[in-house]
Amino acid sequence: IPAPSIRLVPPYPSSQEDPIHIACMAPGNFPGANFTLYRGGQVVQLLQAPTDQRGVTFNLSGGSSKAPGGPFHCQYGVLGELNQSQLSDLSEPVNVSFPVPTW
């Protein structure tokens, strides 16, 4: 099943202490999916979309960006025929960067 879209939700972090908000959206025909957020292959958070909605927002507290590993990806799962769980492809990566200090 098709990959979700992924994007940073404003406000964008300006330091490692700022929270990070990441939205993941499934295609329109997959509402109520279960979403998993990964960083560098490690599970960061799981969220389920409401039954009438196709997206979630992961809210990560400040300092989450300090964790080692690669960029963020997300993936969703839905129940298919015979109640078998089907997983989507991984989303494109999203990188979190901070402005270079001016001092």
């Epitope: 404003p10 406000p11 700022d18 929270p19 908000h21 959206m25 909605q53 196709r54 997206g55 809210n59």
Partner: antibody
Framework: QVTLKESGPALVTPTQNLTLTCTVS??????????WGWIRQPPGKGLEWIGS???????YYNPSLKSRVTISVDTSKNQFSLKLSSVTAADTAVYYC??????????????WGQGTLVTVSS | QSVLTQPPSVSGAPRQRVTISCSGS????????VNWYQHPPGKAPKLLIY???LLPSGVSDRFSGSKSGTSASLAISGLQSEDEADYYC???????????FGTGTKLTVL
């Protein structure tokens, strides 16, 4: 049911500082799903976003007001506050506090206070 | 000066349909989702539409939103007298790094 209520002076003298407080009831200000913001409406004009704060203290401000604005949060009292320095008559407005919810892949202001009219005059 | 432009006023007779436009640029509407708020006189603003076209629970399905490119629209069908209010589009502007509201549109039900 979440409610927000603004409190503070109705009249402020030019060049003074304005401080308003928003008290949140029926929900925790410390949730990771919300920002808490201030929006104003000068008489006969439209809505203008002033700035917002996260429970952790992270803030972001309207660039046109940034040099005069400070927003702070007191999680123990479930309150957040706006300080606007060196006010002028142009700061006369109805000031609203509001909750910004992060949900469903985006965000929106879902709960608003009733607003408080602040007049800047000598 | 707002970076989102709306018509100052629109009007319609009861049971008619009206639309309110909101014009922006790539840094706001073009790259970000749009919300719509209803602001009745003397009351607090109320969320009407979020994420371009989604309806919050409790809001009448007479209201609908759409977006194309750097413009968004709010449609109100079956106009009622209680719809009289100011309406604002809103989104995020990546250039300003902040929330922006439209100039506002006053709806009059004739």
């Amino acid at each position: 049911q979440v409610t927000l209520k603004e409190s503070g002076p109705a009249l402020v003298t030019p060049t003074q500082n304005l401080t308003l407080t928003c008290t949140v009831s029926g929900g925790s200000i410390s949730s990771s799903s919300y920002y808490w913001g201030w929006i104003r409406q000068p008489p006969g004009k439209g809505l203008e976003w002033i700035g917002s704060i996260y429970y952790s203290g992270s803030t972001y401000y309207n660039p046109s007001l940034k040099s005069r604005v400070t927003i702070s949060v007191d999680t123990s009292k479930n309150q957040f506050s706006l300080k606007l320095s060196s006010v002028t008559a142009a700061d006369t407005a109805v000031y609203y506090c509001a909750r910004r919810r992060n949900s469903s892949g985006w965000f929106y202001f879902d709960y608003w206070g009733q607003g408080t009219l602040v007049t800047v005059s000598s | 000066q707002s970076v989102l432009t709306q018509p100052p006023s629109v009007s319609g007779a009861p049971r008619q349909r009206v639309t309110i436009s909101c014009s922006g640029s790539r840094s706001n509407i073009g790259d970000n989702a749009v919300n719509w708020y209803q602001h009745p006189p003397g009351k607090a603003p109320k969320l009407l539409i979020y994420y371009d076209d989604l309806l919050p629970s409790g809001v009448s399905d007479r209201f609908s939103g759409s977006k194309s490119g750097t413009s968004a629209s709010l449609a109100i069908s079956g106009l009622q007298s209680e719809d009289e209010a100011d309406y604002y589009c809103a989104t995020w502007d990546d250039s300003l790094n902040g929330h922006v509201f439209g100039t506002g549109t006053k709806l009059t039900v004739l």
